[in-house]
């Protein structure tokens, strides 16, 4: 007699075989907050940007990627304290002389109004009200993201 | 009438509420290989270490973390070609003068016998037979990992 969870494993496996989708997260893990189709984890501790990237990765997540101004505002609304800064997944690419998301896409200049310099060793943080360029070695909090809904398996045949 | 997948969402949600576990991956995605309780993605293309870290992260996975010599050997057994090197999630921390996994733990000196120098801008790669220190800017393949089984949500509270 299979448990309901074991049965689910079979059901979802069969579904994935048909659709090449993976189950994805069905709901946000403990300590993560849902924002639309994402789960966000706002760290309490601080780290340089590269350690923050590594931390999100070991949590099988990504530093926050922000699609547009609307998503930025909704994310900022979740920040309680005006004085706190959080790393997101955007830094300055010296070779490409541009702000670059960790997924490889360049920043659309209309999306975020960045305060500070675009130069080597600059990474992007957000506060409750603004977006800042900081030295990547600065130790501040960070935000990890996970896709909440089942996503088409585009990244898997993907890598 | 709920579909079996919708029912599963409820079942797994209820299970998670009881155990604070998340569903995790029920099976490995396309192109990923199962090794015990992990799904591994051996890239075909090449990247510097930091780009490899970012690639795994955007795939909601981590550069490979190796627990012990036994896991190293089993991973190496999946590498077909003697000449190919793969980045893993281990690099040299200059400030701490030690090899450090991307999850923040230090290398147990008994686990891996590293060929090459422990110095700034050194990252670790594995081949079919050995473990090497390479310049992090070198373009080689990389290995991403995802936990296959539902994992206790141990990595989330401590951020």
């Amino acid at each position: 007699q299979k448990s309901s969870i074991e049965k689910c494993s079979v059901d979802i496996q069969q579904s994935r075989n048909k659709t090449t989708e993976r189950p994805g997260l069905l709901n946000c893990p403990i300590y993560w907050q849902q924002l639309r189709e994402k789960c966000l984890l706002f760290s309490h501790t601080v780290n340089p940007w590269n350690n923050s990237l590594a931390d999100c990765s070991t949590k099988e997540s990504s530093l926050l990627l922000i699609r547009d101004k609307d998503e930025l505002i909704h994310t900022q609304n979740l920040i309680r304290d005006k004085a706190i800064l959080f790393w997101i997944g955007l830094n300055f690419s010296l070779s490409e002389k541009n702000w670059k998301w960790i997924n490889g896409s360049f920043l659309n200049s209309n999306d975020l109004e960045i305060r500070g310099d675009a130069k080597e060793n600059s990474c992007i943080s957000i506060s409750q009200t603004s977006v800042y360029s900081e030295y990547c070695s600065t130790e501040i909090r960070w935000i990890c993201q996970k896709e909440l809904t089942p996503v088409r398996n585009k990244v898997y045949p993907d890598s | 009438q709920k579909s079996s997948i919708e029912k599963c969402s409820v079942d797994i949600q209820q299970s998670r509420n009881k155990t604070t576990e998340r569903p995790g991956l029920l099976n490995c995605p396309i192109y990923w290989q199962q090794l015990r309780e992990k799904c591994l993605l051996f890239s075909h293309t090449v990247n510097p270490w930091n780009n490899s870290l970012a690639d795994c992260s955007t795939k909601e996975s981590s550069l490979l973390l190796i627990r012990d010599k036994d896991e190293l050997i089993h991973t190496q057994n999946l590498i077909r070609d003697k000449a190919i090197l793969f980045w893993i999630g281990l690099n040299f921390s200059l400030s701490e003068k030690n090899w450090k996994w991307i999850n923040g733990s230090f290398l147990n000196s008994n686990d891996l016998e590293i060929r090459g120098d422990a110095k700034e801008n050194s990252c670790i790669s594995i081949s079919q037979t050995s473990v090497y220190s390479e310049y992090c800017s070198t373009e080689i393949r990389w290995i991403c990992q995802k936990e296959l089984t539902p994992v206790r949500n141990k990595v989330y509270p401590d951020s």
Partner: antibody, heavy 121, light 107 residues
Framework: EVQLLESGGGLVQPGGSLRLSCAAS????????MSWVRQAPGKGLEWVSA????????YYADSVKGRFTISRDNSKNTLYLQMNSLRAEDTAVYYC??????????????WGRGTLVTVSS | DIQMTQSPSSVSASVGDRVTITCRAS??????LAWYQQKPGKAPKLLIY???SLQSGVPSRFSGSGSGTDFTLTISSLQPEDFATYYC?????????FGGGTKVEIK
């Protein structure tokens, strides 16, 4: 819109040179290895060359090795193919192609429309 | 280099027919095989990757199977828009190699 657009093809004499360009848009170009694939008139597909995402690693088909050079400018989202010492057998439609995943060289899910290179005296 | 041999080189079929195209690799490539469709004057279109995974937007009448050295593309019920040339391609090792193509013509 996700697309690749080749340019730079044309008529060239044997021994001559051409530089093809491929402008990418709508996806994270700098995270993907990219390839050139060609097709001679009435013939099948032939892979020509590939370049890693960061641009430091390149590969070539034996038929073009030493004559063609692949390169990329990630700041411009552009892929290039410098073709020297052209021969009649290089006459083909040249396509740039993107793989399905950032970890793959092949399984091309996005192709340009192609640019015709004709080598003739 | 891995040689990819496709057969037949051409096939005549009618709408509604089941069409099978085979591809053989000169050495084992696990499941690193893709299938493409190409129509005259157009770029190729990815149909199947990883030997059997259907690319997004491709009709379910297309299916792929096989592993190692022998692979098959099947069109379960041929439609008018399926008349084209089909290519297999191995992605196991560089250089990437394609099969010679199979032209599916109207009977």
């Amino acid at each position: 819109e996700v697309q690749l657009l080749e340019s730079g093809g044309g008529l060239v004499q044997p021994g001559g040179s051409l530089r093809l360009s491929c402008a990418a848009s709508g996806f994270a170009f700098s995270t993907y290895a990219m390839s050139w694939v060609r097709q001679a008139p009435g013939k099948g597909l032939e892979w020509v060359s590939a370049i890693s995402a960061a641009g430091g690693t390149t590969y070539y088909a034996d038929s073009v090795k030493g004559r063609f050079t692949i390169s990329r400018d990630n700041s411009k989202n552009t892929l290039y193919l410098q073709m020297n010492s052209l021969r009649a057998e290089d006459t083909a439609v040249y396509y740039c192609a993107k793989p399905l995943d950032s970890s793959l060289w092949a399984d091309f899910d996005l192709w340009g429309r192609g640019t015709l290179v004709t080598v003739s005296s | 280099d891995i040689q990819m041999t496709q057969s037949p080189s051409s096939v005549s079929a009618s709408v509604g027919d089941r069409v099978t195209i085979t591809c053989r690799a000169s050495q084992g490539i696990d499941s690193w095989l893709a299938w493409y469709q190409q129509k005259p004057g157009k770029a190729p279109k990815l149909l199947i990757y990883a030997a059997s995974s259907l690319q997004s937007g491709v009709p379910s009448r297309f299916s792929g199977s096989g592993s190692g050295t022998d692979f098959t593309l099947t069109i379960s019920s041929l439609q008018p828009e399926d008349f084209a040339t089909y290519y297999c391609q191995q992605a196991s090792v560089l250089p990437i190699t394609f099969g010679g193509g199979t032209k599916v013509e109207i009977k």
